[in-house]
Amino acid sequence: LEVSESPGSIQVARGQPAVLPCTFTTSAALINLNVIWMVTPLSNANQPEQVILYQGGQMFDGAPRFHGRVGFTGTMPATNVSIFINNTQLSDTGTYQCLVNNLPDIGGRNIGVTGLTVLVPPSAPHCQIQGSQDIGSDVILLCSSEEGIPRPTYLWEKLDNTLKLPPTATQDQVQGTVTIRNISALSSGLYQCVASNAIGTSTCLLDLQVISPQPRNIG
């Protein structure tokens, strides 16, 4: 019995179906086929879980969180024992193993390993201004998404004809911050943060209103 090499890892957007491949060759009939799919979740590496089981001509459910979402892609028994997972969740990320036994065929490699990564587009980020908006001050524009896998990068731009940040601005696309030093009236305007990763983008906006000192009435 020989389980074929798997593609190594699969990436899927949250909520989309994933197919985890596992095929094997055997010299014996599939009368005593026994297949166990296990997962070692990324979130809990020391707690492997059963995903689905085929034994004695019957299918059995694995861990409750997979109920109704998992099944074999083809009619069993077969030499293709790939499975699908519908409505993938972040918690489905992990290392999946298919363990195949088909007595009396013993020996050879009977385990296939596939990594599954569930990707999450950035959630709508929150934009915030830190610091005084009085003319001459330094301000920091903050942007962060609560969700996003892979971790989003953040790009700030000013929404006007140029889409360019003021010349006194420095940007950190990893942290999602823009520091604008010595703000002037020209710093005022709409600033958009674009949070993006491999599978999506999301935005938020800020209205920076730089306040000039008001002339005092004398008398």
């Epitope: 709508a124 929150h126 915030q128 958009q192 938020c204 209205d207």
Partner: antibody, heavy 119, light 106 residues
Framework: EVKLVESGRGLVQPGGSLKLSCAAS????????MSWVRQTPEKRLEWVAY????????YYPDTVKGRFTISRDNAKNTLYLQMSSLKSEDTAMYYC????????????WGQGTLVTVSA | QIVLSQSPAILSASPGEKVTMTCRAS?????MHWYQQKPGSSPKPWIY???NLASGVPARFSGSGSGTSYSLTISRVEAEDAATYYC?????????FGRGTKLEIK
């Protein structure tokens, strides 16, 4: 009390021009960004133009870009909207609105001025 | 651009009833703002940044939501609440408004 009063209403032919004004009082005009928002006869609300508090930054939706120009005179506490190449779909009630805080939302509205574009 | 779908289009309620109207965005947004408009008047700011009541808005109003789903709730409807309520976002450019929910009092 914040007060925004629009003027410049009129009936204009397609392709024509019109300038709207908005007189502001009851607040330090130069400290706030402003926008124009319109409401179509079907009661749909559409943002038309934005200008920063100092007037150095303006922004428009694609529907009016190149045809409308927003400006302000902070010494006169007045906001303007110059509209040209007007189309029938520009027919609407035009409101001037003041922004507040750092979230772009329309915190104060004028009573509106009606612009009708028709042959 | 983000499309805001308001439901129901028309909401009929009796005084004292609790009512909820919803605003669904075609993509996730950071905040939702709400405006009240009565016939012949300009829109009034009602709720900003999802849950903050604008000045002068009665405490029976509340706003909530996140992501793509937001709502405005009136705990006990009064006759003066009859109006059209619009949601608005400017998390994503350009800013967009919903088509409104018209609240009628029986």
């Amino acid at each position: 009390e914040v007060k925004l009063v629009e003027s410049g209403r009129g009936l204009v032919q397609p392709g024509g021009s019109l300038k709207l004004s908005c007189a502001a009082s009851g607040f330090t005009f130069s400290s706030y960004s402003m926008s124009w928002v319109r409401q179509t006869p079907e009661k749909r609300l559409e943002w038309v133009a934005y200008i920063s508090n100092g007037g150095g930054s303006t922004y428009y939706p694609d529907t009016v870009k190149g045809r409308f120009t927003i400006s302000r005179d902070n010494a006169k506490n007045t906001l303007y909207l110059q509209m040209s190449s007007l189309k029938s779909e520009d027919t609407a009630m035009y409101y001037c609105a003041r922004h507040d805080g750092n979230y772009p939302w329309f915190a104060y509205w004028g009573q509106g001025t009606l612009v009708t574009v028709s042959a | 651009q983000i499309v805001l779908s308001q439901s129901p289009a028309i909401l009929s309620a009796s005084p004292g009833e609790k009512v909820t109207m919803t605003c669904r965005a075609s993509s996730s947004v950071s905040y939702m703002h709400w405006y009240q408009q009565k016939p012949g008047s300009s829109p009034k700011p009602w709720i900003y940044a999802t849950s903050n009541l604008a000045s002068g808005v009665p405490a029976r109003f509340s706003g909530s939501g996140s992501g793509t789903s937001y709502s405005l709730t009136i705990s006990r409807v009064e006759a003066e609440d009859a109006a059209t309520y619009y949601c608005q976002q400017w998390s994503s450019d350009p800013p967009t408004f919903g088509r409104g929910t018209k609240l009628e009092i029986k």
